[in-house]
């Protein structure tokens, strides 16, 4: 066959939908490869062809759009299934051609099996809330597209495996879910069930997220220096080891990157020669606010190094802020006999 | 008013387990955490595990983690805590403390069952 | 494990003086999940202040708790006989979640 641009199997998009639910799959050439929609391919004479290879096979065969109830079918660059069976699972291709020009994208779908509390294999996606932060709304996802807004589809919410009904502090409004208070009882899995009728058949179209509450920005801070600090003198001999630890402190902030780094006379450790090692743990909040630690160590330390800065650095979005740690040289007692000579005046 | 009720004192002999149950009455019980904090005679309190029953949600603190369970009904309103290997230091009157409403502090609490372990 | 340090151990005042309690803390509290309870002999602990600063529900005015990071104060204005108990604070934003060893409040 004559040439055709490849994109591969575009793994970036591992499409996940529930057994026995619609699902509506767009092409992903127009969202992710080309830079022209499906409306402009089509009136330019281009035609969208769909094949797929079952799962656990090789060969390529054309999707069958002549089922009962139409229950596979094409509309523009959606793939519609009414409803999915478990054995749709597969790699599926759209190539958009005609005589002079070819592209093609295959993309996992896998067809997924629910419990009865939607516990499943699905990879959910999280919405983060705000602690105490005012009312707050989830959207149930990914159903647009599904039925006209002239449907007016009947929406369940469940919490975990129950119907959320006389919660406190969590409201179901149609399409969202409002709390008015989020708390880190509140955290778990959450679930829209969206019913709507469609040529005398019911379907059913089940959304699973996780929320997880985390720090608000009204209680964000600078990061902050717990350690070194000004009440902690490292005080060592030449040929010991040194440990400090940076332990430092940050706020939850929504993409905010945190970094921690120590500067030994104002370079970084990888920049200078003596022998230093650093190892970094982190732990995080109920509310995931940040600690990070990092141990600055040199196994054997000279009088040299002993006489060095060391300073910890850490930044977020919030701002930079730096610590000196005060590391200062033993100074040895003096040996009796010495001692006592200057006692009585010796020189 | 929420309240909650938990079982009454036990005495144990070391080695063995104790299962303290915590009921709530008045409220809804399930979308709250309960948590478990003991107190041994003449000390101060310490923060042992906690549970949201609706979601079977349980952390523990490290130094119970292999020792402690912590389970909800739904049905009975009930928390429970189970503590194995006991040793004579787990002498201490254990609370149940709900989560509050509006904020994850503590804001009821149980009235407190006295555990004894003693051979 | 965030550390609480409480002091003084043993606060000696007559009513209807100011009685001012500190907490620190060994790394920043998270969220400000900072609370103070009051424990009477033979009785559960009951919730003061949460979140640092906000009175729970029936809690007189005469208490009130302020700080931020790792530096924290319950002070009550005028102390009544029935505040003579012994005060925790406790740390909620982070697992484990712990407590002070407490300030005692006796009577002078």
């Known amino acids: 066959s004559e040439r055709c641009d490849d994109w591969g199997l575009d793994t970036m998009r591992q499409i996940q939908v529930f057994e026995d639910e619609p699902a509506r799959i767009k092409c992903p050439l127009f969202e992710h490869f080309l830079k022209f929609n499906y409306s402009t391919a089509h009136s330019a004479g281009l035609t969208l062809i769909w094949y797929w290879t079952r799962q656990d096979r090789d060969l390529e065969e054309p999707i069958n759009f002549r089922l009962p109830e139409n229950r596979i079918s094409k509309e523009k660059d959606v793939l519609w299934f009414r409803p999915t069976l478990l054995n749709d699972t597969g790699n599926y291709t759209c190539m958009l051609r005609n005589t002079t020009y070819c592209s093609k994208v295959a993309f996992p779908l896998e067809v997924v099996q629910k419990d009865s509390c939607f516990n499943s294999p699905m990879k959910l996606p999280v919405h983060k809330l705000y602690i105490e932060y005012g009312i707050q709304r989830i959207t149930c996802p990914n159903v647009d597209g599904y039925f006209p807004s002239s449907v007016k589809p009947t929406i369940t919410w469940y919490m975990g495996c129950y119907k959320i009904q006389n919660f406190n502090n969590v409201i179901p409004e149609g399409m969202n879910l409002s709390f008015l208070i989020a708390l880190i009882s509140n955290n778990g899995n959450y679930t829209c069930v969206v019913t709507y009728p469609e040529n005398g058949r019911t379907f059913h179209l089940t959304r699973t997220l996780t929320v997880k509450v985390v720090g608000s920005p009204k209680n964000a801070v600078p990061p902050v220096i717990h350690s070194p600090n000004d009440h902690v003198v490292y005080e060592k001999e030449p040929g010991e080891e040194l440990l400090i630890p940076c332990t430092v402190y940050f706020s939850f902030l929504m993409d905010s990157r945190n970094e921690v780094w120590w500067t030994i006379d104002g370079k970084k450790p990888d920049d200078i020669t003596i022998d230093v090692t650093i190892n970094e743990s982190i732990s995080h909040s109920r509310t995931e606010d940040e600690t990070r630690t990092q141990i600055l160590s040199i196994k054997k330390v000279t009088s040299e190094d002993l006489k060095r800065s060391y300073v910890c650095h850490a930044r977020s979005a919030k701002g930079e802020v730096a610590k000196a740690a005060k590391v200062k040289q033993k100074v040895p007692a003096p040996r009796y006999t010495v001692e006592l000579a200057c006692g009585f005046g010796a020189t | 008013q929420v309240q909650l009720l938990q079982s009454g004192a036990e005495v144990k002999k070391p080695g063995s387990s104790v299962k303290v149950s915590c009921r709530a009455s008045g409220g809804t019980f399930s979308i709250y955490a309960i948590d478990w904090v003991r107190q041994a005679p003449g000390q101060g309190l310490e923060w042992m595990g906690g549970i949201i029953p609706i979601s079977g949600t349980e952390n523990s603190a490290q130094n119970f983690q292999d020792r402690i369970t912590i389970t909800a009904d739904k049905s009975t309103n009930t928390a429970y805590m189970e503590l194995s290997s006991l040793r004579s230091e787990d002498t201490a009157v254990y609370y149940c403390?709900?989560?509050?409403?509006?904020?994850?502090?503590?804001?009821?609490w149980g009235q407190g069952t006295m555990v004894t372990v003693s051979s | 494990e965030i550390v609480l340090t409480q002091s003084p151990g043993t606060l000696s005042l007559s009513p209807g003086e100011r009685a001012t309690l500190s907490c620190r803390a060994s790394?920043?509290?998270?969220?400000?999940?900072l609370a103070w309870f009051q424990q009477r002999p033979g009785q559960a602990p009951r919730l003061l202040i949460y979140?640092?600063?906000r009175r729970a529900t029936g809690i007189p005015d005469r208490f009130s708790g302020s700080g931020s990071g790792t530096d924290f104060t319950l002070t009550i204005s005028r102390l009544e006989p029935e505040d003579f108990a012994v005060y925790y604070c406790?740390?909620?934003?982070?697992?484990?979640?712990?407590f002070g060893g407490g300030t005692k409040v006796e009577i002078k």
């Open positions: 790394l920043s509290v998270s969220s400000n999940y």
């Open positions: 403390a709900r989560n509050g409403a509006t904020s994850d502090a503590f804001d009821i």
């Open positions: 406790q740390q909620y934003g982070s697992s484990p979640l712990t």
């Open positions: 979140g640092v600063s």
